[in-house]
């Protein structure tokens, strides 16, 4: 449920992205799939630090959602899980009325 691939761990180690405001983050990367296993178990919003959305493409045939929790652990969440869809919709609505959702693009080597 809480397994993360080596490539994700490497990305975390070498990433120099600065912290952002807002909880939703969209990344376009050239790396392959990050998530070995996905969980659909609900995580209350108050325990979530941020959510990374990795759109499909660039070597990964599926959309991936990575949740960073307030206890410093990380979990890949099934994008089809109803709760994460609802939560992202709420967060999108909030961000559109306050701050735009930050989008980061990593250059393809």
């Amino acid at each position: 449920m809480k397994f993360i691939s080596t490539s994700l761990l490497l990305m975390l180690l070498v990433s120099s992205l600065s912290p952002v405001q807002g909880v939703l983050e969209v990344y376009y990367t050239s790396l392959r799939c990050r998530c070995v296993q996905e969980s659909s178990v609900f995580i209350p919003r108050r325990f979530i630090d941020r959510i990374q959305i990795l759109p499909r493409g660039n070597g990964c045939p599926r959309k991936e959602i990575i949740v960073w929790k307030k206890n410093k652990s990380i979990v890949c969440v099934d994008p089809q899980a109803e709760w994460i869809q609802r939560m992202m919709e709420v967060l999108r609505k909030r961000s559109s009325s306050t701050l735009p959702v930050p989008v980061f693009k990593r250059k393809i080597p």
Epitope: M1, V41, F42, I43, P44, R46, K70, N71, R94, T98
Partner: antibody, heavy 121, light 106 residues
């Protein structure tokens, strides 16, 4: 009827340990996140720790990290708080509370009666 | 961490009075706020959740409002059983309680 009953409180010396228990009944215990909240005598409420459904995820307030451990036994419908390296400022009534929420409707709506922990030499 | 500033810390009022208690959050918590009533020696009792949704069984004289950083609990006509301490709780990011408002008989 939802019922939460805490036990295990008492007088302990600074640096000592104590294990609190919370027996739950009247609801499907494993369907809920659970929390411990404390209240120092004559003071306000303070969230202490939370745990997810299966015990795999735990969260703590900064002042108890590394000293307190929240755990649960779903087979026994029980929640626990292991408290080590106790300090005078940990003196409080400790409550357990339900706190799972999908839409906000269950956040800390059921509480136990509390158990008093006194840390003093 | 999100701080919750509750005011007033104490309040004297009479039966039949309209009373308002305020909670201010140090940052936006949207509507993720809960109100509790606590009587001496008892566990807190939830009155309102998600800012304005009344807990089942709670009298309609209690109401909540607000959004973002400012929230209020209103008791439209105080009854003798309402004299107690009231706490707010933010549940947007972990948990933080307000310091409490002690409502006393004038």
């Amino acid at each position: 009827e939802v019922q939460l009953v805490e036990s295990g409180g008492g007088l302990v010396q600074p640096g000592g340990s104590l294990r609190l228990s919370c027996a739950a009944s009247g609801f499907t215990f494993s369907d809920y996140y659970m929390a411990w909240v404390r209240q120092a005598p004559g003071k306000g409420l303070e969230w202490v720790a939370s745990i997810n459904y299966d015990g795999g995820d735990t969260y703590y307030r900064d002042s108890v990290k590394g000293r307190f451990t929240i755990s649960r036994d779903n087979a026994k419908n029980s929640l626990y708080l292991q408290m080590n390296s106790l300090r005078a400022e940990d003196t409080a009534v400790y409550y357990c509370a339900t706190e799972e929420d999908y839409d906000g409707s269950y956040v800390m709506d059921a509480w136990g009666q509390g158990t008093l922990v006194t840390v003093s030499s | 961490d999100i701080q919750m500033t509750q005011s007033p810390s104490s309040l004297s009022a009479s039966v039949g009075d309209r009373v308002t208690i305020t909670c201010k959050a140090s940052q936006n918590i949207n509507k993720e706020l809960t109100w509790y009533q606590q009587k001496p020696g008892k566990a807190p009792k939830r009155l309102i959740y998600n800012t304005n949704i009344l807990q089942t069984g709670v009298p309609s004289r209690f109401s909540g409002s607000g959004s973002g950083t400012e929230f209020t609990l209103t008791i439209s006509s105080l009854q003798p059983e309402d004299f107690a301490t009231y706490f707010c709780l933010q549940q947007s990011s972990l948990y933080t309680f307000g310091q409490g408002t002690k409502l006393e008989i004038k």
